[in-house]
Interface confidence: low
């Protein structure tokens, strides 16, 4: 267990031309706050995917009012660190998203009270217990300077916070085979309490006798790499011989979500939907009030004046979840009919209809044949939103106005010659072939392959196509 800590040093215009306009104005003051989202591994997942390692919000910064005519300076920042507690081992490699949010203190009819000003993301390697790492990230014309570190919570130590340290039992030295816990020389590494044989690289334990696997490893001793390429079952534990996932207990078995959270399986792990007042990977973090700004995406926080009273996030259209953190994919319900393209504009759904369809959900089939005539005895056929003429023999084109050349498509097989005829076409077959399109070979003994030549026609005679 441990804590990831993020310190924002500055947020302001980046170097170079095109300095951004201040996000706050004289008549619409605003203040900034930050959100950090952590994911294990070097994943390149979408910004909306769960923050599996955890997430945190900063306090609100001081209210800032732009001085008219002045360029945007570095903006006043919230006090303190952003802290993301992690319960399991620190993964060593992680992805981060840091969002800079603007809280507008002015009226915004037709818009939210909060808006995302900048989002930076990156993938880093970081050992727990190490020094602060400094970073600079740019998002458009903005520049964010920050530092971060991961530290273990006692008694955990080590680069993954998986080793345990205990105070020395003897004043002079540690027990047999046990090292001092640098840099805490007055403490000793605790005896290994994991299940015997548990992989020291890929497994860890928090309780005596257990063996819990880091991401990407499975098996009772965490010695089997997860490989789902040839597997049908979506979950483990794995078969030690193939490394293939076979049916077994799922990630939600035993409900890892605390404080009444409900668990749902995801392709790689699980996700907790937390009740109000709790958040974190396993709903383990509590004491959140509206002052902490727990509602994302313009959600309105009510109640929750003190840590003992729950807050409620009222989400704007297009977002859901106890903290408005989930974007509603309203197009997944496929509301547009007849092949229309669904567009989720946030405040509304729009359907872009295919030709021949109309209406808010493309539900109206326009009468394609209305007012349209097919020439030369053709008949109009509606279908797929496009008017189409089924033309009489000898005519073609959109409206059957063109004389068709029945031989244009080379319909006579095996070298047969095509002749246009008043009622269609006639194929004169090459020796050895017969049929309306010269498609049937004639057997050497003179008997034809099925179908038999009609009476009165010798093999090789032109076959008239009726």
């Amino acid at each position: 267990a441990g804590v990831f800590e993020l310190q924002i040093h500055s947020f302001g215009p980046g170097p170079g031309p095109g300095a951004p306009r201040s996000p706050c104005s004289a008549r619409l003051p605003c203040r900034l706050f930050f959100r950090v989202c952590l994911k294990p591994g070097l994943s390149e997942e979408a910004a909306e995917s769960p923050c599996a390692l955890g997430a945190a919000l900063s306090a609100r910064g001081p209210v800032y009012t732009e001085q008219p005519g002045a360029p945007a300076p570095d903006l006043p920042l919230p006090d303190g660190l952003l802290q993301v507690p992690f319960r399991d081992a620190w993964p060593g490699t992680f992805s981060f998203i840091i969002e800079t949010w603007r809280e507008e203190l002015g009226d915004q009819i037709g818009g939210p009270a909060w808006s995302l000003l900048a989002r930076v993301a990156g993938r880093r390697r970081l050992a727990a217990g190490g020094p602060w790492a400094r970073d600079i990230q740019r998002a458009g014309a903005w520049e964010l300077r920050f530092s971060y570190r991961a530290r273990c919570e006692p008694p955990a130590v080590g680069t993954a916070c998986t080793r345990l340290c205990r105070p020395r039992s003897a004043p002079s030295r540690c027990g047999p085979g046990l090292r001092p816990c640098a840099p805490l020389e007055d403490e000793c590494e605790a005896p290994l309490v994991c299940r015997a044989g548990c992989s020291p690289e890929h497994g860890f334990c928090e309780q005596p006798g257990e063996c819990r696997c880091l991401e990407g490893w499975t098996g009772p001793l965490c010695t089997v790499p997860v490989s789902t390429s040839s597997c049908l079952s979506p979950r483990g534990p794995s078969s030690a011989t193939t490394g293939c996932l076979v049916p077994g207990p799922g990630p939600c078995d035993g409900n890892p979500c605390a404080n009444g959270g409900s668990c749902s399986e995801t392709p790689r792990s699980f996700e907790c939907t937390c009740p109000r007042g709790f958040y974190g990977l396993r709903c383990e973090v509590s004491g959140v009030t509206c002052a902490d700004g727990p509602c994302f995406n313009g959600g309105l926080c009510v109640g929750g004046a003190d840590p003992d009273s729950a807050y409620i996030c009222h989400c704007p259209p297009g977002f859901q979840g106890s903290n408005c953190e989930k974007r509603v994919d309203r197009c997944s319900l496929q509301p547009c009919r007849n092949g229309g393209l669904c567009l989720d504009l946030g405040h509304a759904l729009r359907c872009r209809c295919r030709a021949g369809f109309a209406g808010p959900r493309c539900e109206h089939d326009l009468d394609d044949c209305a007012g349209r005539a097919c020439a030369n005895g053709g008949t109009c056929v509606e279908g797929g939103g496009a008017h189409r003429c089924s033309c009489a023999l000898g005519f073609g084109g959109r409206d059957c106005r063109e004389r068709a050349d029945p031989c244009a498509a080379r319909p006579c097989a095996h070298g047969g010659r095509c002749y246009a005829h008043f009622s269609g076409l006639v194929c004169a077959c090459a020796p050895g072939y017969m049929g309306a399109r010269c498609e049937f070979p004639v057997h050497p003994d003179g008997a034809s392959a099925l179908p038999a030549a009609p009476p009165g026609l010798r093999p090789g005679d032109p076959q008239r196509y009726l």
């Epitope: 004289a26 008549r27 619409l28 002015g106 009226d107 009819i109 509206c290």
Partner: antibody, heavy 118, light 107 residues
Framework: EVQLQQSGPELVKPGASVKISCKTS????????MHWVKQSHGKSLEWIGG????????SYSQKFKGKATLTVDKSSSTAYMELRSLTSEDSAVYYC???????????WGQGTTLTVSS | NIVMTQSPESMSMSVGERVTLSCKAS??????VSWYQQKPDQSPKLLIY???NRYTGVPDRFTGSGSATHFTLTISSVQAEDLADYHC?????????FGAGTKLELK
């Protein structure tokens, strides 16, 4: 000094339409939303709707949809409210109010008295 | 729609007295409540926004408090110029709604 100057009193016949104006000065017009409020019989206030001059966003009270139309002219920093199909129920004082903080009306016009009578 | 209920409808006070006006919302509106003062033949004026924030230039004898559904406007020591109607309004959700008002009269 911020000022919201409304057009003068109106006496109109039932069934007619009227357009009330609210000319602003002393602040950047596009940085504050403009709301309209009806006050009947000198007592309760009724919100008609609001418009954001910056992005054109409009919100109406359901009760006044079809009755009121809100528009702005950014070039003259003026907001307008048109009321149509007037009846005696529409006789009231109408105020425009700008909101600096979120939907709190920090400045109000002096009010326009509308009388609908045959 | 959210209904804002003010009480009492009217009250008569003497100069120097402490006055408490009440406003109740039919559902939780957080702290999105404002108070307006309207003197006879004048337009309303903003006194309090965000339930408890005193607007610029408003005397400190006016205090707003409350959250969720119960809100109060307190005048610690009533002055003659405070004779007016007082309206509360919510801006938690559209449509914005106001209470029916409380008329403050002087004895």
């Amino acid at each position: 000094e911020v000022q919201l100057q409304q057009s003068g009193p109106e006496l109109v016949k039932p069934g007619a339409s009227v357009k009330i104006s609210c000319k602003t000065s002393g602040y950047t017009f596009t940085e504050s939303a403009m709301h309209w409020v009806k006050q009947s019989h000198g007592k309760s206030l009724e919100w008609i709707g609001g418009i954001n001059p910056n992005n054109g966003g409009i919100s109406y009270s359901q009760k006044f949809k079809g009755k009121a139309t809100l528009t702005v002219d950014k070039s003259s920093s003026t907001a307008y409210m048109e009321l149509r199909s007037l009846t005696s129920e529409d006789s009231a004082v109408y105020y425009c109010g700008s909101s600096y903080y979120r939907d709190y009306f920090d400045y109000w016009g002096q009010g326009t008295t509308l009388t609908v009578s045959s | 729609n959210i209904v804002m209920t003010q009480s009492p409808e009217s009250m008569s006070m003497s100069v120097g007295e402490r006055v408490t006006l009440s406003c109740k919302a039919s559902e939780n509106v957080g702290t999105y409540v404002s108070w307006y003062q309207q003197k006879p033949d004048q337009s309303p004026k903003l006194l309090i926004y965000g339930a408890s924030n005193r607007y610029t230039g408003v005397p400190d004898r006016f205090t707003g408090s409350g959250s969720a559904t119960h809100f109060t406007l307190t005048i610690s020591s009533v002055q003659a110029e405070d004779l007016a109607d007082y309206h509360c309004g919510q801006s938690y959700s559209y449509p914005l709604t106001f209470g029916a008002g409380t008329k403050l009269e002087l004895k």
